[in-house]
Interface confidence: low
Protein backbone atom coordinates (compact mmCIF):
# COMPACT_ATOMS: atom_id res chain seq x y z
CA UNK A 1 0.00 0.00 0.00
CA UNK A 2 1.34 3.62 -0.93
CA UNK A 3 2.13 5.70 2.05
CA UNK A 4 3.09 9.18 0.34
CA UNK A 5 1.71 10.79 -2.50
CA UNK A 6 4.20 12.00 -5.46
CA UNK A 7 6.35 14.77 -4.65
CA UNK A 8 4.48 18.25 -6.02
CA UNK A 9 6.55 21.07 -7.99
CA UNK A 10 6.67 23.96 -6.77
CA UNK A 11 7.81 26.92 -8.79
CA UNK A 12 8.11 31.04 -8.46
CA UNK A 13 5.55 33.29 -11.11
CA UNK A 14 7.10 35.44 -12.89
CA UNK A 15 10.75 34.44 -11.67
CA UNK A 16 12.60 33.22 -8.53
CA UNK A 17 14.40 36.30 -8.37
CA UNK A 18 12.64 38.96 -6.94
CA UNK A 19 13.21 43.12 -6.98
CA UNK A 20 12.14 43.97 -3.48
CA UNK A 21 8.47 45.58 -3.14
CA UNK A 22 7.87 43.80 -6.43
CA UNK A 23 5.14 40.90 -6.11
CA UNK A 24 5.92 37.10 -6.74
CA UNK A 25 3.49 33.69 -6.67
CA UNK A 26 4.57 30.96 -5.39
CA UNK A 27 2.91 27.75 -7.40
CA UNK A 28 2.51 24.27 -5.98
CA UNK A 29 1.00 21.64 -8.27
CA UNK A 30 0.20 18.11 -6.84
CA UNK A 31 -2.86 16.49 -8.19
CA UNK A 32 -6.60 16.46 -8.63
CA UNK A 33 -8.65 15.64 -5.98
CA UNK A 34 -6.15 17.27 -2.98
CA UNK A 35 -8.03 19.00 -0.64
CA UNK A 36 -5.12 20.73 1.10
CA UNK A 37 -1.72 22.46 0.16
CA UNK A 38 0.67 23.71 3.19
CA UNK A 39 3.62 26.39 2.05
CA UNK A 40 6.55 25.87 4.32
CA UNK A 41 8.71 28.80 4.70
CA UNK A 42 12.74 27.84 6.23
CA UNK A 43 11.12 24.59 7.62
CA UNK A 44 8.11 26.45 9.17
CA UNK A 45 4.06 26.12 8.36
CA UNK A 46 3.99 29.37 6.01
CA UNK A 47 0.01 29.04 4.31
CA UNK A 48 -2.48 26.75 4.00
CA UNK A 49 -4.86 26.45 0.83
CA UNK A 50 -7.73 24.23 0.49
CA UNK A 51 -8.82 24.42 -3.19
CA UNK A 52 -12.28 24.17 -4.27
CA UNK A 53 -13.72 22.40 -5.84
CA UNK A 54 -10.74 20.23 -5.41
CA UNK A 55 -11.36 17.47 -7.96
CA UNK A 56 -10.88 20.38 -10.68
CA UNK A 57 -7.85 21.53 -9.68
CA UNK A 58 -4.23 20.68 -9.08
CA UNK A 59 -2.32 23.82 -8.21
CA UNK A 60 -2.43 26.66 -5.99
CA UNK A 61 -0.97 29.88 -5.75
CA UNK A 62 0.36 31.61 -2.97
CA UNK A 63 0.76 35.48 -3.45
CA UNK A 64 3.66 37.71 -1.92
CA UNK A 65 2.71 41.12 -2.40
CA UNK A 66 5.66 43.12 -1.38
CA UNK A 67 8.62 41.05 -1.54
CA UNK A 68 11.78 42.21 1.08
CA UNK A 69 14.65 40.27 2.39
CA UNK A 70 12.55 38.36 5.48
CA UNK A 71 10.45 36.54 2.51
CA UNK A 72 13.49 35.48 0.84
CA UNK A 73 14.58 32.18 2.02
CA UNK A 74 13.80 28.79 1.08
CA UNK A 75 10.66 27.38 0.31
CA UNK A 76 8.53 23.81 0.24
CA UNK A 77 5.01 22.51 -0.29
CA UNK A 78 2.88 19.25 0.28
CA UNK A 79 -0.41 18.66 -0.57
CA UNK A 80 -2.91 15.94 0.71
CA UNK A 81 -5.58 13.49 -0.67
CA UNK A 82 -8.05 12.73 1.74
CA UNK A 83 -5.67 11.51 4.96
CA UNK A 84 -2.91 10.84 2.53
CA UNK A 85 -0.23 13.68 2.66
CA UNK A 86 2.66 14.07 -0.37
CA UNK A 87 6.12 13.92 -0.13
CA UNK A 88 7.43 17.45 -0.03
CA UNK A 89 7.97 18.97 -3.10
CA UNK A 90 12.04 20.13 -4.10
CA UNK A 91 13.05 23.60 -2.25
CA UNK A 92 12.34 26.81 -3.96
CA UNK A 93 14.90 29.07 -3.25
CA UNK A 94 13.22 32.78 -3.68
CA UNK A 95 15.88 35.62 -3.90
CA UNK A 96 15.00 39.01 -3.24
CA UNK A 97 16.95 41.58 -5.94
CA UNK A 98 17.88 45.17 -5.86
CA UNK A 99 18.80 45.61 -2.78
CA UNK A 100 21.60 47.82 -2.04
CA UNK A 101 23.99 48.50 -5.47
CA UNK A 102 24.87 47.49 -8.99
CA UNK A 103 27.56 45.38 -10.02
CA UNK A 104 29.28 45.71 -13.28
CA UNK A 105 30.01 42.71 -15.64
CA UNK A 106 32.58 42.34 -18.71
CA UNK A 107 33.98 39.76 -20.60
CA UNK A 108 37.69 39.43 -21.51
CA UNK A 109 38.90 39.11 -24.48
CA UNK A 110 35.51 40.73 -25.75
CA UNK A 111 31.78 40.25 -26.11
CA UNK A 112 32.26 38.60 -29.99
CA UNK A 113 34.90 35.53 -29.65
CA UNK A 114 35.30 32.56 -32.00
CA UNK A 115 35.32 28.89 -31.04
CA UNK A 116 38.42 27.74 -28.52
CA UNK A 117 39.10 31.16 -27.03
CA UNK A 118 39.25 31.26 -23.52
CA UNK A 119 36.44 33.51 -21.99
CA UNK A 120 36.51 34.55 -18.52
CA UNK A 121 33.32 36.68 -17.17
CA UNK A 122 34.31 39.22 -14.20
CA UNK A 123 31.45 40.63 -12.00
CA UNK A 124 32.79 43.73 -9.75
CA UNK A 125 31.03 45.40 -6.97
CA UNK A 126 32.51 47.72 -4.47
CA UNK A 127 30.33 47.49 -0.89
CA UNK A 128 31.04 44.36 1.04
CA UNK A 129 29.98 41.30 -0.12
CA UNK A 130 31.92 38.12 -0.87
CA UNK A 131 29.64 35.95 -3.18
CA UNK A 132 28.56 36.72 -6.79
CA UNK A 133 26.19 35.27 -9.58
CA UNK A 134 26.55 35.40 -12.81
CA UNK A 135 23.48 33.75 -15.13
CA UNK A 136 23.22 33.03 -18.47
CA UNK A 137 19.43 34.04 -19.42
CA UNK A 138 17.23 31.34 -21.62
CA UNK A 139 15.68 28.41 -20.32
CA UNK A 140 18.29 26.53 -18.44
CA UNK A 141 18.75 29.69 -16.65
CA UNK A 142 21.66 28.75 -15.64
CA UNK A 143 23.60 29.80 -12.35
CA UNK A 144 27.54 29.96 -11.51
CA UNK A 145 28.88 31.14 -8.21
CA UNK A 146 32.02 32.94 -7.56
CA UNK A 147 33.97 34.43 -4.88
CA UNK A 148 35.75 37.46 -4.23
CA UNK A 149 36.70 40.29 -2.37
CA UNK A 150 35.20 43.00 -4.64
CA UNK A 151 35.60 40.75 -7.78
CA UNK A 152 34.76 37.43 -9.19
CA UNK A 153 36.10 35.75 -11.90
CA UNK A 154 33.85 33.41 -13.93
CA UNK A 155 36.09 31.59 -16.55
CA UNK A 156 33.87 30.04 -19.18
CA UNK A 157 37.28 28.05 -20.76
CA UNK A 158 38.07 27.25 -24.32
CA UNK A 159 33.91 28.30 -25.68
CA UNK A 160 31.90 26.83 -28.33
CA UNK A 161 28.61 28.16 -29.71
CA UNK A 162 26.59 27.07 -27.00
CA UNK A 163 27.72 29.66 -24.48
CA UNK A 164 26.14 32.08 -26.88
CA UNK A 165 24.05 34.07 -24.83
CA UNK A 166 22.93 37.11 -22.59
CA UNK A 167 25.24 36.99 -19.37
CA UNK A 168 24.26 39.16 -16.41
CA UNK A 169 25.67 39.27 -12.65
CA UNK A 170 24.87 39.89 -9.00
CA UNK A 171 26.46 40.61 -6.04
CA UNK A 172 25.07 38.41 -3.04
CA UNK A 173 24.95 39.61 0.40
CA UNK A 174 23.34 36.43 1.35
CA UNK A 175 22.28 33.25 -0.27
CA UNK A 176 18.65 34.95 -0.70
CA UNK A 177 19.73 38.61 -0.97
CA UNK A 178 21.59 40.05 -4.18
CA UNK A 179 22.17 43.45 -5.85
CA UNK A 180 20.58 45.01 -8.70
CA UNK A 181 21.49 43.06 -11.82
CA UNK A 182 23.97 44.18 -13.75
CA UNK A 183 23.49 45.61 -17.10
CA UNK A 184 23.80 42.62 -19.74
CA UNK A 185 26.28 41.41 -22.09
CA UNK A 186 25.83 40.03 -24.90
CA UNK A 187 28.05 36.91 -25.61
CA UNK A 188 28.45 36.25 -29.45
CA UNK A 189 30.52 32.81 -30.71
CA UNK A 190 31.03 32.65 -33.98
CA UNK A 191 32.50 29.27 -36.14
CA UNK A 192 35.65 26.85 -35.31
CA UNK A 193 38.89 29.32 -35.29
CA UNK A 194 40.52 27.28 -38.12
CA UNK A 195 37.92 28.97 -40.38
CA UNK A 196 37.93 32.55 -39.12
CA UNK A 197 40.09 35.96 -39.67
CA UNK A 198 41.27 37.47 -37.78
CA UNK A 199 38.16 40.27 -36.62
CA UNK A 200 38.20 44.18 -36.66
CA UNK A 201 40.76 45.80 -34.07
CA UNK A 202 38.59 47.00 -31.45
CA UNK A 203 35.64 45.03 -30.10
CA UNK A 204 32.51 47.31 -29.14
CA UNK A 205 29.74 45.72 -25.96
CA UNK A 206 26.05 45.58 -27.24
CA UNK A 207 24.32 48.67 -27.26
CA UNK A 208 20.87 46.86 -26.53
CA UNK A 209 19.84 46.71 -22.92
CA UNK A 210 16.57 44.86 -21.82
CA UNK A 211 14.35 46.84 -19.93
CA UNK A 212 14.01 43.96 -17.37
CA UNK A 213 15.82 41.27 -16.34
CA UNK A 214 12.87 39.59 -15.19
CA UNK A 215 12.27 36.71 -17.57
CA UNK A 216 8.65 36.69 -18.63
CA UNK A 217 6.07 33.69 -19.73
CA UNK A 218 7.39 34.17 -23.41
CA UNK A 219 10.57 32.22 -22.67
CA UNK A 220 8.50 29.66 -21.50
CA UNK A 221 10.47 29.31 -18.59
CA UNK A 222 7.56 29.23 -15.88
CA UNK A 223 5.61 26.30 -18.13
CA UNK A 224 8.13 24.22 -17.79
CA UNK A 225 7.71 22.95 -13.98
CA UNK A 226 10.26 20.75 -13.88
CA UNK A 227 13.14 22.47 -15.54
CA UNK A 228 12.19 25.24 -12.26
CA UNK A 229 12.33 22.42 -9.85
CA UNK A 230 15.91 21.70 -11.12
CA UNK A 231 16.66 25.11 -11.40
CA UNK A 232 15.99 26.84 -7.87
CA UNK A 233 17.15 23.45 -6.12
CA UNK A 234 20.60 23.39 -7.77
CA UNK A 235 20.75 27.13 -7.44
CA UNK A 236 22.31 27.71 -4.38
CA UNK A 237 23.85 24.20 -3.60
CA UNK B 1 47.56 52.16 -35.61
CA UNK B 2 48.15 50.28 -31.95
CA UNK B 3 51.17 51.65 -29.89
CA UNK B 4 53.06 51.39 -26.79
CA UNK B 5 55.51 53.96 -25.55
CA UNK B 6 57.55 52.66 -22.61
CA UNK B 7 59.16 55.62 -20.51
CA UNK B 8 62.91 55.58 -20.76
CA UNK B 9 66.07 53.69 -19.38
CA UNK B 10 66.92 54.05 -15.35
CA UNK B 11 69.69 53.47 -13.21
CA UNK B 12 68.38 52.65 -9.77
CA UNK B 13 70.89 52.05 -6.65
CA UNK B 14 69.97 48.36 -5.08
CA UNK B 15 67.11 48.65 -2.47
CA UNK B 16 65.20 51.73 -4.14
CA UNK B 17 62.11 51.28 -6.50
CA UNK B 18 61.26 52.45 -10.17
CA UNK B 19 57.97 52.86 -11.67
CA UNK B 20 57.92 52.09 -15.33
CA UNK B 21 54.79 53.58 -17.88
CA UNK B 22 53.73 52.03 -20.75
CA UNK B 23 51.24 54.35 -22.43
CA UNK B 24 48.68 52.82 -25.14
CA UNK B 25 47.37 54.25 -28.10
CA UNK B 26 45.85 53.76 -31.40
CA UNK B 27 42.69 51.77 -29.41
CA UNK B 28 40.43 51.12 -26.64
CA UNK B 29 42.67 50.85 -23.25
CA UNK B 30 40.00 49.47 -21.53
CA UNK B 31 39.25 46.33 -23.48
CA UNK B 32 42.55 44.78 -23.36
CA UNK B 33 44.95 43.40 -21.14
CA UNK B 34 48.56 45.20 -21.05
CA UNK B 35 51.26 42.11 -19.64
CA UNK B 36 54.75 42.97 -17.92
CA UNK B 37 57.61 41.35 -19.00
CA UNK B 38 60.95 40.94 -18.42
CA UNK B 39 64.07 39.78 -20.07
CA UNK B 40 67.95 39.88 -18.51
CA UNK B 41 71.06 40.34 -20.41
CA UNK B 42 71.64 37.27 -22.95
CA UNK B 43 68.12 35.57 -21.33
CA UNK B 44 64.69 34.27 -22.53
CA UNK B 45 61.53 36.56 -21.53
CA UNK B 46 60.10 35.79 -18.12
CA UNK B 47 56.24 37.03 -17.57
CA UNK B 48 55.58 39.39 -14.53
CA UNK B 49 52.17 39.77 -14.44
CA UNK B 50 49.08 41.26 -16.29
CA UNK B 51 46.47 44.01 -15.30
CA UNK B 52 42.90 44.60 -17.21
CA UNK B 53 42.74 48.14 -17.28
CA UNK B 54 38.84 48.24 -17.70
CA UNK B 55 38.67 46.63 -13.86
CA UNK B 56 41.31 47.19 -12.37
CA UNK B 57 42.39 43.24 -12.08
CA UNK B 58 45.78 42.12 -11.67
CA UNK B 59 47.18 38.82 -12.03
CA UNK B 60 51.05 38.20 -10.95
CA UNK B 61 53.49 35.54 -11.47
CA UNK B 62 54.11 34.12 -8.11
CA UNK B 63 57.54 35.11 -8.46
CA UNK B 64 57.01 38.62 -8.60
CA UNK B 65 54.22 39.18 -6.21
CA UNK B 66 56.41 40.95 -3.66
CA UNK B 67 58.45 42.36 -6.01
CA UNK B 68 56.29 44.21 -8.95
CA UNK B 69 52.76 46.62 -8.30
CA UNK B 70 51.05 46.60 -11.52
CA UNK B 71 48.69 49.42 -12.30
CA UNK B 72 46.54 51.47 -14.84
CA UNK B 73 44.97 54.70 -15.40
CA UNK B 74 42.19 54.87 -17.38
CA UNK B 75 42.12 58.55 -17.74
CA UNK B 76 45.93 58.83 -19.61
CA UNK B 77 45.42 55.44 -20.96
CA UNK B 78 48.65 54.53 -19.42
CA UNK B 79 49.85 51.26 -17.81
CA UNK B 80 52.32 51.79 -14.64
CA UNK B 81 54.76 48.94 -13.23
CA UNK B 82 56.43 49.42 -9.82
CA UNK B 83 59.36 47.26 -8.77
CA UNK B 84 60.85 47.60 -5.37
CA UNK B 85 63.56 46.63 -3.37
CA UNK B 86 65.70 46.49 -6.29
CA UNK B 87 68.47 44.02 -7.03
CA UNK B 88 70.83 43.67 -9.03
CA UNK B 89 69.77 40.44 -10.53
CA UNK B 90 66.51 43.28 -11.21
CA UNK B 91 69.12 44.64 -14.12
CA UNK B 92 66.88 43.98 -17.03
CA UNK B 93 64.70 45.26 -20.14
CA UNK B 94 61.09 45.65 -19.25
CA UNK B 95 58.62 45.25 -22.25
CA UNK B 96 54.78 45.80 -22.00
CA UNK B 97 52.72 44.13 -24.48
CA UNK B 98 49.16 44.11 -25.60
CA UNK B 99 46.92 41.23 -24.68
CA UNK B 100 45.46 39.75 -28.67
CA UNK B 101 41.67 40.47 -29.65
CA UNK B 102 41.34 36.85 -28.70
CA UNK B 103 41.42 34.98 -25.40
CA UNK B 104 44.38 33.03 -26.81
CA UNK B 105 46.68 34.44 -24.63
CA UNK B 106 49.19 36.00 -27.33
CA UNK B 107 50.84 39.23 -26.98
CA UNK B 108 50.26 41.00 -30.37
CA UNK B 109 51.51 44.60 -29.85
CA UNK B 110 54.49 45.33 -27.66
CA UNK B 111 56.12 48.52 -25.92
CA UNK B 112 59.74 49.19 -26.95
CA UNK B 113 61.05 48.22 -23.50
CA UNK B 114 62.70 50.16 -21.10
CA UNK B 115 65.98 49.00 -19.29
CA UNK B 116 66.50 48.96 -15.85
CA UNK B 117 69.70 48.91 -14.64
CA UNK B 118 70.38 48.37 -10.88
CA UNK B 119 74.23 49.16 -9.91
CA UNK B 120 75.93 50.65 -7.01
CA UNK C 1 54.38 26.07 -13.91
CA UNK C 2 54.65 24.43 -17.55
CA UNK C 3 58.12 24.49 -18.69
CA UNK C 4 58.49 25.16 -22.35
CA UNK C 5 61.60 23.94 -23.77
CA UNK C 6 62.77 25.08 -27.36
CA UNK C 7 65.39 23.42 -29.79
CA UNK C 8 67.90 23.76 -31.15
CA UNK C 9 68.91 27.11 -29.22
CA UNK C 10 70.51 28.26 -32.73
CA UNK C 11 70.89 27.30 -35.70
CA UNK C 12 72.17 28.37 -38.92
CA UNK C 13 70.78 28.14 -42.45
CA UNK C 14 71.51 29.17 -46.09
CA UNK C 15 68.92 32.22 -47.57
CA UNK C 16 65.76 30.06 -48.88
CA UNK C 17 66.22 26.84 -46.89
CA UNK C 18 63.73 25.77 -44.82
CA UNK C 19 63.76 25.87 -41.37
CA UNK C 20 62.26 23.89 -38.40
CA UNK C 21 62.17 24.94 -34.59
CA UNK C 22 60.48 22.83 -32.15
CA UNK C 23 59.18 23.54 -28.82
CA UNK C 24 58.04 20.96 -26.04
CA UNK C 25 55.93 21.87 -23.49
CA UNK C 26 55.94 19.98 -19.87
CA UNK C 27 51.98 19.39 -19.82
CA UNK C 28 49.28 19.37 -22.51
CA UNK C 29 48.66 22.99 -23.28
CA UNK C 30 45.84 22.16 -25.87
CA UNK C 31 46.24 24.34 -28.94
CA UNK C 32 47.47 27.72 -26.68
CA UNK C 33 50.90 28.21 -28.17
CA UNK C 34 52.09 31.01 -29.80
CA UNK C 35 55.32 32.50 -31.61
CA UNK C 36 57.74 35.59 -31.57
CA UNK C 37 60.21 36.91 -33.55
CA UNK C 38 63.19 38.96 -32.00
CA UNK C 39 65.33 41.05 -33.73
CA UNK C 40 68.05 42.52 -31.01
CA UNK C 41 67.76 45.56 -29.63
CA UNK C 42 64.19 45.52 -30.17
CA UNK C 43 60.28 43.86 -29.03
CA UNK C 44 59.27 41.01 -29.48
CA UNK C 45 56.76 40.65 -32.36
CA UNK C 46 53.84 38.19 -32.35
CA UNK C 47 54.00 35.76 -35.81
CA UNK C 48 51.42 33.20 -35.37
CA UNK C 49 48.85 32.45 -32.24
CA UNK C 50 46.99 29.49 -31.49
CA UNK C 51 49.37 27.04 -32.76
CA UNK C 52 48.63 27.83 -36.66
CA UNK C 53 47.16 31.50 -37.10
CA UNK C 54 49.28 33.83 -38.68
CA UNK C 55 48.73 37.55 -36.73
CA UNK C 56 48.18 40.07 -39.83
CA UNK C 57 51.08 41.48 -41.35
CA UNK C 58 52.74 38.16 -41.14
CA UNK C 59 54.47 37.17 -44.22
CA UNK C 60 52.98 33.25 -45.01
CA UNK C 61 56.55 31.80 -45.23
CA UNK C 62 55.84 31.52 -41.84
CA UNK C 63 53.94 28.75 -40.32
CA UNK C 64 53.21 26.40 -37.03
CA UNK C 65 51.76 23.37 -36.14
CA UNK C 66 51.41 20.97 -33.25
CA UNK C 67 48.55 20.06 -30.55
CA UNK C 68 49.37 18.95 -26.79
CA UNK C 69 52.66 18.90 -25.95
CA UNK C 70 54.79 19.11 -29.45
CA UNK C 71 55.12 21.85 -31.79
CA UNK C 72 56.39 23.00 -34.94
CA UNK C 73 57.83 26.65 -36.71
CA UNK C 74 58.74 26.68 -39.45
CA UNK C 75 60.43 29.25 -42.00
CA UNK C 76 59.62 27.71 -45.47
CA UNK C 77 61.91 29.89 -47.00
CA UNK C 78 64.58 32.13 -45.18
CA UNK C 79 64.83 35.50 -45.90
CA UNK C 80 68.04 37.45 -45.01
CA UNK C 81 65.42 40.00 -42.67
CA UNK C 82 64.37 36.74 -40.69
CA UNK C 83 67.46 36.91 -39.24
CA UNK C 84 66.54 36.92 -35.26
CA UNK C 85 65.72 34.81 -32.33
CA UNK C 86 62.40 33.22 -31.86
CA UNK C 87 60.62 32.04 -29.25
CA UNK C 88 57.75 30.03 -28.41
CA UNK C 89 54.96 30.98 -25.80
CA UNK C 90 52.53 28.89 -24.04
CA UNK C 91 49.03 30.70 -23.44
CA UNK C 92 47.23 27.69 -21.88
CA UNK C 93 47.79 28.31 -18.37
CA UNK C 94 48.80 31.43 -16.04
CA UNK C 95 51.90 31.97 -15.28
CA UNK C 96 52.28 32.71 -19.14
CA UNK C 97 55.54 31.16 -19.75
CA UNK C 98 58.41 31.29 -22.61
CA UNK C 99 60.54 28.76 -24.30
CA UNK C 100 64.51 29.86 -24.16
CA UNK C 101 64.52 31.13 -27.34
CA UNK C 102 66.53 29.79 -30.97
CA UNK C 103 69.07 32.04 -32.95
CA UNK C 104 68.82 32.02 -36.29
CA UNK C 105 71.97 32.98 -38.50
CA UNK C 106 72.61 33.01 -42.07
CA UNK C 107 75.55 30.69 -43.15
Known amino acids: QQQTLPKPFIWAEPHFMVPKEKQVTICCQGNYGAVEYQLHFEGSLFAVDRPKPPERINKVKFYIPDMNSRMAGQYSCIYRVGELWSEPSNLLDLVVTEMYDTPTLSVHPGPEVISGEKVTFYCRLDTATSMFLLLKEGRSSHVQRGYGKVQAEFPLGPVTTAHRGTYRCFGSYNNHAWSFPSEPVKLLVTGDIENTSLAPEDPTFPADTWGTYLLTTETGLQKDHALWDHTAQNLLR | QVQLVQSGAEVKKPGSSVKVSCKASGYTFTDYVINWGRQAPGQGLEWIGE????????YYNEKFKAKATITADKSTSTAYMELSSLRSEDTAVYFCARRGRYGLYAMDYWGQGTTVTVSS | DIQMTQSPSSLSASVGDRVTITCRASQDISNYLNWYQQKPGKAPKLLIY???RLHSGVPSRFSGSGSGTDFTFTISSLQPEDIATYFCQQGNTRPWTFGGGTKVEIK
Open chain 3, 50 to 52: YTS
Open chain 2, 51 to 58: IYPGSGTN
